[in-house]
């Protein structure tokens, strides 16, 4: 009955502070409406990074001010988080909820440890 969610253990953000990873879920039924939430866990505190609800076959739509973008393909969601800095290094958990049709299912991944390294400032040129 439990819904399994898989995501990579580790991802390294690029020099522009962008990190991408795939969140894949094993759907116990044929969901038509899915909500994907990215959570950040630091110590024992969990906070929401971004969330999107989408209809199967349609694009994910995050809020305009979201730092996340994404695309879906079947039971896979390709997530991209932008604007990351070194202080944002941490565990990012993918949570998937099958909102419709019944029954509701929720699945939580084990988390992706995203490492962010701030770029070195360019040396002044004479």
């Amino acid at each position: 009955k439990a819904m399994h969610v898989a995501q990579p253990a580790v991802v390294l953000a690029n020099s522009r502070g962008t990190a991408s990873f795939v969140c894949e879920y094993a759907s116990p039924g044929k969901a038509t409406e899915v909500r994907v939430t990215v959570l950040r866990q630091a110590d024992s505190q969990v906070t929401e990074v971004c969330a999107a609800t989408y209809m199967m076959g349609n694009e994910l739509t995050f809020l305009d001010d979201s730092i996340c973008t994404g695309t879906s393909s079947g039971n896979q969601v390709n997530l991209t988080i932008q604007g990351l800095r070194a202080m944002d290094t941490g565990l990012y958990i993918c949570k998937v909820e099958l909102m419709y049709p019944p029954p509701y299912y929720m699945g939580i991944g084990n988390g992706t440890q995203i490492y962010v390294i701030d770029p070195e400032p360019c040396p002044d040129s004479d």
Epitope: A2, L39, V46, M99
Partner: antibody, heavy 118, light 108 residues
Framework: QVQLVESGGGVVQPGRSLRLSCAAS????????MHWVRQAPGKGLEWVTF????????YYADSVKGRFTISRDNSKNTLYLQMNSLRAEDTAIYYC???????????WGQGTLVTVSS | EIVLTQSPGTLSLSPGERATLSCRAS???????LAWYQQKPGQAPRLLIY???SRATGIPDRFSGSGSGTDFTLTISRLEPEDFAVYYC?????????FGQGTKVEIK
């Protein structure tokens, strides 16, 4: 701090209606799914109904399906439970509860007592 | 529907003793989706453990959870006077959300 405050309970005759409210504060209400859970006198906890973030998706226990309606007003940070065709077996303390980020019910209201009696 | 069965119904112990409460599911529950709650008379339930073994904010470390699949356990290592209460397990991975019938931990 997170607070959930239920109201609207009372004594009502069988077959009549009642509407419960749950006022939420201390968090961004629209970012959380919500539930109603009830507890009959001296008994255990029984999940009653669930509502999604925007109120679009709702789920009900078989015991209340077709009689109870859950709704929410995100602009007022308030959760509602409309209870129609009440029965004696609906007598209980009704709690509203917030779904935590990882799924458990992390905050509960203090409860409101509904007594269905003639 | 996942049915949760708790045992024993009542546990009579003295302060300082160890309490072991069991919760058995009728079908597999992912460990990420099992919680324990404490309820004292006249109060709302309080979340103790989620994800089978993670303590909720502010919960003392004498409370611990374990288990997977269909068998889960809540352990209170040394009972304090304020721990005498009713404890419920719950699964929250799929609808309908279900609770066990509760275990009452009473003073012997």
């Amino acid at each position: 701090q997170v607070q959930l405050v239920e109201s609207g309970g009372g004594v009502v005759q069988p077959g009549r209606s009642l509407r419960l409210s749950c006022a939420a504060s201390g968090f961004t209400f629209s970012h959380y799914t919500m539930h109603w859970v009830r507890q009959a006198p001296g008994k255990g906890l029984e999940w009653v109904t669930f509502i999604s973030y925007d109120g679009h998706n709702k789920y009900y226990a078989d015991s209340v399906k077709g009689r109870f309606t859950i709704s929410r007003d995100n602009s007022k940070n308030t959760l509602y439970l409309q209870m129609n065709s009440l029965r004696a077996e609906d007598t209980a303390i009704y709690y509203c509860a917030r779904t935590g980020w990882l799924g458990p019910f992390d905050y509960w209201g203090q409860g409101t007592l509904v007594t269905v009696s003639s | 529907e996942i049915v949760l069965t708790q045992s024993p119904g009542t546990l009579s112990l003295s302060p300082g003793e160890r309490a072991t409460l069991s919760c058995r599911a009728s079908q597999e529950v992912g460990e990420s989706y099992l919680a324990w709650y404490q309820q004292k008379p006249g109060q709302a339930p309080r979340l103790l453990i989620y994800g089978a073994f993670s303590r909720a904010t502010g919960i003392p470390d004498r409370f611990s959870g374990s288990g997977s699949g269909t068998d889960f356990t809540l352990t209170i290592s040394r009972l304090e006077p304020e721990d005498f209460a009713v404890y419920y397990c719950q699964q929250y991975g799929s609808s309908p959300w279900t609770f066990g019938q509760g275990t009452k931990v009473e003073i012997k």
